[in-house]
Interface confidence: medium
Amino acid sequence: LQDPCSNCPAGTFCDNNRNQICSPCPPNSFSSAGGQRTCDICRQCKGVFRTRKECSSTSNAECDCTPGFHCLGAGCSMCEQDCKQGQELTKKGCKDCCFGTFNDQKRGICRPWTNCSLDGKSVLVNGTKERDVVCGPSPADLSPGASSVTPPAPAREPGHSPQ
Protein backbone atom coordinates (compact mmCIF):
# COMPACT_ATOMS: atom_id res chain seq x y z
CA LEU A 1 0.00 0.00 0.00
CA GLN A 2 1.34 3.41 -0.95
CA ASP A 3 1.86 5.85 1.91
CA PRO A 4 -0.63 8.72 1.29
CA CYS A 5 1.98 11.10 2.70
CA SER A 6 4.25 10.45 -0.29
CA ASN A 7 1.86 12.58 -2.37
CA CYS A 8 2.53 15.69 -0.26
CA PRO A 9 4.91 17.96 -2.20
CA ALA A 10 7.69 20.20 -0.90
CA GLY A 11 6.20 23.22 0.85
CA THR A 12 3.63 21.06 2.64
CA PHE A 13 3.52 18.49 5.42
CA CYS A 14 1.39 15.41 5.84
CA ASP A 15 -1.07 16.36 8.56
CA ASN A 16 -1.92 13.43 10.83
CA ASN A 17 -4.54 15.57 12.57
CA ARG A 18 -6.50 15.89 9.35
CA ASN A 19 -6.55 12.40 7.81
CA GLN A 20 -3.07 12.76 6.36
CA ILE A 21 -4.11 15.68 4.15
CA CYS A 22 -1.28 17.81 2.72
CA SER A 23 -1.21 21.05 4.73
CA PRO A 24 0.87 24.08 3.73
CA CYS A 25 3.88 24.85 5.86
CA PRO A 26 3.04 27.51 8.44
CA PRO A 27 4.70 30.93 8.12
CA ASN A 28 8.42 30.92 8.90
CA SER A 29 8.75 27.23 8.12
CA PHE A 30 9.57 25.13 5.07
CA SER A 31 9.80 21.59 3.75
CA SER A 32 12.35 21.06 1.00
CA ALA A 33 11.23 17.53 0.15
CA GLY A 34 7.91 15.81 -0.32
CA GLY A 35 6.32 13.40 2.11
CA GLN A 36 7.41 15.20 5.27
CA ARG A 37 5.31 14.93 8.43
CA THR A 38 6.41 18.31 9.74
CA CYS A 39 7.90 21.48 8.31
CA ASP A 40 11.22 22.84 9.53
CA ILE A 41 11.62 26.21 11.22
CA CYS A 42 13.23 28.79 8.97
CA ARG A 43 16.66 30.04 9.91
CA GLN A 44 16.55 33.62 11.19
CA CYS A 45 19.42 35.89 10.17
CA LYS A 46 19.71 38.21 13.17
CA GLY A 47 22.34 40.44 14.69
CA VAL A 48 25.61 40.15 12.81
CA PHE A 49 23.95 37.81 10.28
CA ARG A 50 22.29 39.27 7.18
CA THR A 51 19.66 37.58 5.05
CA ARG A 52 21.21 36.52 1.76
CA LYS A 53 18.15 34.54 0.65
CA GLU A 54 14.69 34.70 2.20
CA CYS A 55 13.05 31.57 3.51
CA SER A 56 10.35 30.17 1.25
CA SER A 57 7.90 27.35 1.83
CA THR A 58 10.32 24.99 0.07
CA SER A 59 13.78 26.24 1.09
CA ASN A 60 15.49 27.59 4.18
CA ALA A 61 16.79 31.11 4.53
CA GLU A 62 20.49 31.66 3.86
CA CYS A 63 22.57 34.10 5.86
CA ASP A 64 25.82 35.93 5.33
CA CYS A 65 27.64 38.40 7.57
CA THR A 66 27.37 42.17 7.91
CA PRO A 67 30.32 44.23 6.58
CA GLY A 68 33.35 43.90 8.82
CA PHE A 69 32.67 40.20 9.40
CA HIS A 70 33.07 37.03 7.35
CA CYS A 71 31.38 33.63 7.35
CA LEU A 72 32.79 30.57 9.07
CA GLY A 73 31.44 27.05 9.20
CA ALA A 74 29.02 25.12 7.04
CA GLY A 75 26.22 27.33 5.73
CA CYS A 76 27.75 30.39 7.42
CA SER A 77 27.00 29.12 10.90
CA MET A 78 29.27 31.77 12.45
CA CYS A 79 30.42 35.29 11.68
CA GLU A 80 33.99 36.22 12.58
CA GLN A 81 35.33 39.76 12.76
CA ASP A 82 37.54 40.95 9.89
CA CYS A 83 40.97 42.31 10.65
CA LYS A 84 43.24 44.37 8.41
CA GLN A 85 45.93 42.83 6.29
CA GLY A 86 48.98 42.47 8.51
CA GLN A 87 46.85 41.45 11.50
CA GLU A 88 45.26 38.36 13.00
CA LEU A 89 42.23 37.93 15.25
CA THR A 90 42.98 37.00 18.85
CA LYS A 91 40.81 36.77 21.96
CA LYS A 92 41.71 40.41 22.58
CA GLY A 93 40.79 41.55 19.07
CA CYS A 94 42.89 42.30 16.02
CA LYS A 95 46.65 42.29 16.67
CA ASP A 96 49.52 43.11 14.33
CA CYS A 97 51.51 40.19 13.00
CA CYS A 98 54.72 39.55 14.94
CA PHE A 99 58.01 40.25 13.16
CA GLY A 100 58.77 37.42 10.79
CA THR A 101 55.12 36.66 10.06
CA PHE A 102 52.55 38.05 7.64
CA ASN A 103 48.87 37.93 6.73
CA ASP A 104 47.75 39.15 3.31
CA GLN A 105 44.03 38.67 4.04
CA LYS A 106 41.36 40.12 6.32
CA ARG A 107 40.89 36.73 7.98
CA GLY A 108 43.07 33.90 9.17
CA ILE A 109 46.31 33.84 11.13
CA CYS A 110 49.73 35.35 10.59
CA ARG A 111 52.06 32.86 8.86
CA PRO A 112 55.85 32.79 8.94
CA TRP A 113 57.74 34.34 6.07
CA THR A 114 59.15 31.83 3.61
CA ASN A 115 62.68 30.77 4.59
CA CYS A 116 64.43 31.30 1.28
CA SER A 117 67.66 29.73 2.51
CA LEU A 118 65.93 26.34 2.91
CA ASP A 119 65.74 26.25 -0.90
CA GLY A 120 69.23 27.64 -1.21
CA LYS A 121 67.87 30.96 -2.40
CA SER A 122 68.42 34.53 -1.35
CA VAL A 123 65.85 37.10 -0.25
CA LEU A 124 65.01 39.34 -3.18
CA VAL A 125 62.32 41.42 -1.47
CA ASN A 126 61.99 41.63 2.30
CA GLY A 127 58.77 40.50 3.92
CA THR A 128 56.36 42.82 5.72
CA LYS A 129 53.39 42.25 8.03
CA GLU A 130 51.19 42.15 4.93
CA ARG A 131 53.44 40.36 2.42
CA ASP A 132 55.67 37.31 2.33
CA VAL A 133 59.30 37.64 1.33
CA VAL A 134 60.14 37.17 -2.35
CA CYS A 135 62.95 34.68 -2.85
CA GLY A 136 65.48 35.39 -5.59
CA PRO A 137 67.88 33.16 -7.43
CA SER A 138 70.28 31.07 -5.40
CA PRO A 139 73.67 32.66 -4.61
CA ALA A 140 75.29 30.15 -6.99
CA ASP A 141 73.26 31.58 -9.85
CA LEU A 142 74.63 35.02 -9.07
CA SER A 143 78.31 33.99 -8.73
CA PRO A 144 80.80 35.27 -11.35
CA GLY A 145 80.99 33.02 -14.39
CA ALA A 146 77.58 31.55 -13.86
CA SER A 147 75.49 31.50 -17.01
CA SER A 148 72.99 34.29 -17.15
CA VAL A 149 69.38 33.39 -16.61
CA THR A 150 67.66 33.51 -20.00
CA PRO A 151 64.03 34.53 -19.97
CA PRO A 152 61.60 31.90 -21.26
CA ALA A 153 60.69 32.15 -24.93
CA PRO A 154 57.27 33.69 -25.51
CA ALA A 155 54.58 31.08 -26.06
CA ARG A 156 53.29 30.66 -29.59
CA GLU A 157 49.72 30.01 -30.55
CA PRO A 158 49.22 26.44 -31.77
CA GLY A 159 49.36 26.03 -35.51
CA HIS A 160 51.59 29.10 -36.02
CA SER A 161 55.08 28.43 -37.30
CA PRO A 162 57.83 30.96 -36.59
CA GLN A 163 58.23 33.56 -39.30
Partner: nanobody, 122 residues
Framework: EVQLLESGGGLVQPGGSLRLSCAAS????????VGWVRQAPGKGLEWVSA????????YYAESVKGRFTISRDNAKNTLYLQMSSLRAEDTAVYYC???????????????WGQGTLVTVSS
Amino acid sequence: EVQLLESGGGLVQPGGSLRLSCAASGFTVSAEDVGWVRQAPGKGLEWVSAILDKGGSTYYAESVKGRFTISRDNAKNTLYLQMSSLRAEDTAVYYCARIVYHAGGGVTFDTWGQGTLVTVSS
Protein backbone atom coordinates in the same frame (compact mmCIF):
# COMPACT_ATOMS: atom_id res chain seq x y z
CA GLU B 1 -10.25 20.55 25.19
CA VAL B 2 -8.64 22.79 22.58
CA GLN B 3 -11.21 24.03 20.05
CA LEU B 4 -11.52 26.66 17.33
CA LEU B 5 -14.81 27.88 15.91
CA GLU B 6 -14.93 30.08 12.81
CA SER B 7 -17.82 32.34 11.76
CA GLY B 8 -18.49 35.29 9.50
CA GLY B 9 -18.36 33.68 6.07
CA GLY B 10 -20.96 34.26 3.40
CA LEU B 11 -21.65 35.55 -0.09
CA VAL B 12 -20.09 38.89 -1.01
CA GLN B 13 -19.69 40.81 -4.25
CA PRO B 14 -16.26 41.44 -5.79
CA GLY B 15 -14.68 44.48 -4.13
CA GLY B 16 -16.68 43.89 -0.96
CA SER B 17 -15.55 43.17 2.59
CA LEU B 18 -16.08 40.50 5.25
CA ARG B 19 -14.75 39.90 8.74
CA LEU B 20 -14.12 36.33 9.85
CA SER B 21 -13.94 35.43 13.53
CA CYS B 22 -12.34 32.45 15.21
CA ALA B 23 -13.27 31.85 18.84
CA ALA B 24 -10.70 29.77 20.71
CA SER B 25 -11.23 27.64 23.79
CA GLY B 26 -8.79 25.50 25.72
CA PHE B 27 -5.85 27.81 24.99
CA THR B 28 -5.04 31.52 24.91
CA VAL B 29 -4.68 33.09 21.46
CA SER B 30 -2.39 35.83 22.81
CA ALA B 31 0.12 33.20 23.99
CA GLU B 32 0.15 31.02 20.88
CA ASP B 33 0.91 31.25 17.17
CA VAL B 34 -2.36 31.16 15.23
CA GLY B 35 -3.36 31.79 11.65
CA TRP B 36 -5.79 31.42 8.78
CA VAL B 37 -5.59 28.79 6.05
CA ARG B 38 -7.95 28.50 3.09
CA GLN B 39 -8.96 25.90 0.56
CA ALA B 40 -10.44 27.00 -2.75
CA PRO B 41 -12.78 24.58 -4.53
CA GLY B 42 -10.76 21.73 -6.02
CA LYS B 43 -7.47 23.19 -4.80
CA GLY B 44 -4.99 22.42 -2.03
CA LEU B 45 -4.70 24.25 1.26
CA GLU B 46 -3.01 27.66 1.24
CA TRP B 47 -1.96 29.60 4.31
CA VAL B 48 -3.31 33.14 4.29
CA SER B 49 -2.16 34.98 7.39
CA ALA B 50 -0.80 34.40 10.87
CA ILE B 51 0.06 36.16 14.10
CA LEU B 52 3.31 34.79 15.46
CA ASP B 53 4.72 35.11 18.97
CA LYS B 54 3.54 37.21 21.87
CA GLY B 55 4.80 40.34 20.13
CA GLY B 56 2.08 39.88 17.55
CA SER B 57 4.20 39.83 14.39
CA THR B 58 1.83 39.47 11.46
CA TYR B 59 2.44 37.51 8.24
CA TYR B 60 0.47 37.52 5.02
CA ALA B 61 0.58 35.48 1.83
CA GLU B 62 1.55 37.61 -1.18
CA SER B 63 -1.90 37.03 -2.70
CA VAL B 64 -3.67 38.87 0.16
CA LYS B 65 -1.11 41.49 1.23
CA GLY B 66 -2.66 44.94 1.54
CA ARG B 67 -6.21 43.55 1.39
CA PHE B 68 -6.47 41.29 4.46
CA THR B 69 -5.70 42.19 8.08
CA ILE B 70 -5.28 39.69 10.89
CA SER B 71 -5.89 40.71 14.48
CA ARG B 72 -6.87 39.26 17.84
CA ASP B 73 -8.94 40.30 20.81
CA ASN B 74 -7.25 38.93 23.90
CA ALA B 75 -10.22 39.64 26.16
CA LYS B 76 -12.53 37.64 23.88
CA ASN B 77 -9.84 35.06 23.07
CA THR B 78 -10.77 35.49 19.43
CA LEU B 79 -8.81 35.75 16.18
CA TYR B 80 -10.10 37.87 13.29
CA LEU B 81 -9.47 38.20 9.58
CA GLN B 82 -10.69 41.43 8.03
CA MET B 83 -10.97 40.90 4.28
CA SER B 84 -11.47 43.79 1.88
CA SER B 85 -11.26 44.31 -1.90
CA LEU B 86 -12.39 40.72 -2.24
CA ARG B 87 -11.86 38.91 -5.54
CA ALA B 88 -13.42 35.82 -7.09
CA GLU B 89 -10.17 33.95 -6.43
CA ASP B 90 -10.64 34.53 -2.67
CA THR B 91 -13.59 32.12 -2.77
CA ALA B 92 -12.66 29.31 -0.39
CA VAL B 93 -13.36 27.61 2.92
CA TYR B 94 -11.38 29.55 5.53
CA TYR B 95 -10.00 27.69 8.55
CA CYS B 96 -8.26 29.05 11.59
CA ALA B 97 -5.50 26.87 12.98
CA ARG B 98 -3.02 26.78 15.82
CA ILE B 99 0.66 26.41 14.89
CA VAL B 100 2.78 24.14 17.07
CA TYR B 101 6.52 23.65 17.36
CA HIS B 102 7.72 20.13 18.09
CA ALA B 103 10.69 19.19 20.23
CA GLY B 104 12.51 17.79 17.21
CA GLY B 105 12.32 21.14 15.45
CA GLY B 106 9.30 20.46 13.27
CA VAL B 107 6.35 22.79 12.75
CA THR B 108 2.73 21.78 12.09
CA PHE B 109 -0.82 22.95 12.62
CA ASP B 110 -2.32 20.93 15.46
CA THR B 111 -5.84 22.29 15.87
CA TRP B 112 -8.29 23.33 13.16
CA GLY B 113 -11.74 24.81 13.16
CA GLN B 114 -14.52 23.38 11.01
CA GLY B 115 -14.11 26.18 8.45
CA THR B 116 -16.34 28.96 7.14
CA LEU B 117 -17.19 29.35 3.45
CA VAL B 118 -16.51 32.68 1.73
CA THR B 119 -18.01 33.05 -1.73
CA VAL B 120 -17.07 36.08 -3.83
CA SER B 121 -19.43 36.38 -6.76
CA SER B 122 -21.60 38.95 -8.51
